[in-house]
């Protein structure tokens, strides 16, 4: 946030920019938290976007018995690989096609006995709130349909009647990591020393960190005609001062009129 | 990726013999090779299978009368066609497993290559 400085004045504006505030020559350059002329108020949302999208990520083990393990199958680029990889994919991309937030596999390894096959199952979900318990979801339901193709795909009289078979006590889920977004610990962490006041409220299942300074949400300050300051004690009513009154208490709604004043003082003269 | 090439069909008479031909652009040795049928208006049916140790597996339907076989040298794929009947009518077309597929027999799910098909028409 910048404030343009003109005239004689800026020389010394330049020595007061506060807050880490840098003067460029014309103007205060703010950090993130600040803004105005000298970088001395703090702004009163934060920008805590959440990602369009939330990943997950299966680390999984199954052992395909349909197919003979060749050396040739740990080189990437081999023919028999590539065969093997596309057959996989098909063969993954039907069990898990009930699954919304089902990406694809990443094979990551393949080893003997029959076909071990190392691999990712790749999950999305858009963002929401509920994004953690959508995932967690997802991942129940992987590990049910792996586990009942794995029972029900095997090879029987050693003939595979499936476009794959495989050994049932071979799947294992190794491990699942899910993308962290927190948004709570986000607004802390950027609202700095004014962690303990900014907030995070939701609109549209949106994230929006804010404090109370900031209006339109139900923790914000009502400073009636004031103005709504953070400090470092926390969110403050600076009250205005009119033509015709004066302005106090903690959210200004304590208004004096100045000629009831002016007009008793003068009456004691 | 493994071009296949039928060849062999036409029509001929019920009770007649055909021999159909499959060419391939790659190794089949290490595959399980089918030949498939689709009459119009059915589904596509696996008609014989051949493991790459030449195991060999059939539908009921053909049984003792298709012949399935494979020359490794040749790459080439073959269908003995004997004793012909109207329902036999069909686009034939063969097809590929992955390397090293095993426990293979003529279900469609084996197989990821596949030919364009010849047509088979058995009529008097």
């Known amino acids: 946030r910048t404030t343009t400085c003109f005239g004689d004045g800026c020389q010394n504006t330049a020595s007061r920019c506060k807050n880490g505030g840098t003067w460029d020559g014309l103007k205060c350059q703010c950090p993130n938290l600040y803004y105005g002329e000298l970088c001395e108020e703090v702004v009163s949302s934060i920008d805590i976007g959440p990602p369009e999208t939330i990943s997950a990520q299966m680390e999984l083990t199954v052992t395909v018995t349909s197919v003979k393990f060749t050396e040739e199958l740990k080189n990437h680029s081999s023919q028999e690989f590539q065969e093997f990889k596309q057959t996989f994919t098909e063969q993954m991309n039907i069990v898990y096609s009930g699954i919304p937030e089902y990406v694809g596999v990443n094979i990551t390894k393949l080893r003997l006995g029959s076909v071990v096959v190392e691999h990712d199952v790749l999950l999305r979900t858009k963002y929401t709130p509920e994004y953690k318990t959508v995932l967690d979801n997802a991942t129940e339901v992987v590990k049910e349909k792996i586990t009942k193709v794995t029972t029900q795909q095997i090879m029987i009289n050693d003939i595979c009647s499936d476009m794959m078979c495989f050994n049932t006590t071979g799947t294992q889920v190794q491990n699942i990591t899910v993308t962290q977004y927190d948004p709570e610990e986000d607004c802390r962490k950027m609202a700095k020393e004014y962690g303990d006041y900014f907030v995070v409220e939701y609109r549209d299942q949106k994230p929006y960190c804010i404090s109370p300074c900031e209006p339109g949400f139900s923790v914000s300050k009502n400073c009636n005609l004031g103005k709504c300051q953070m400090s470092l004690s926390g969110p403050q009513c600076l009250c205005v001062t009119t033509e015709t009154h004066w302005y106090s208490g903690e959210t200004c709604n304590q208004g004096t009129q100045k000629s009831l004043v002016y007009g008793h003082h003068h009456h004691h003269h | 990726e493994v071009q296949l090439v039928e060849s062999g069909g036409g029509l001929v008479q019920p009770g007649r013999s055909l021999r159909l031909s499959c060419a391939a652009s790659?190794?089949?040795?290490?595959?399980?090779m089918g030949w498939f049928r689709q009459a119009p208006g059915k589904e596509r049916e696996g008609v014989a299978g051949?493991?790459?140790?030449?195991?060999?597996g059939y539908a009921d339907s053909v049984k003792g009368r298709f012949t399935i076989s494979k020359d490794n040298a040749k790459n080439s794929l073959y269908l003995q066609m004997n004793s012909l009947r109207a329902e036999d009518t069909a686009l034939y077309s063969c097809?590929?497993?992955?390397?090293?597929?095993?426990?293979?027999?003529?279900?469609?799910?084996?197989?990821?290559?596949r030919g364009q098909g010849t047509q088979v028409t058995v009529s008097s």
């Open positions: 097809a590929a497993s992955i390397l090293n597929r095993v426990g293979c027999r003529q279900l469609s799910y084996e197989y990821i290559y």
């Open positions: 051949i493991s790459e140790d030449g195991i060999t």
């Open positions: 790659g190794d089949i040795t290490r595959r399980c």
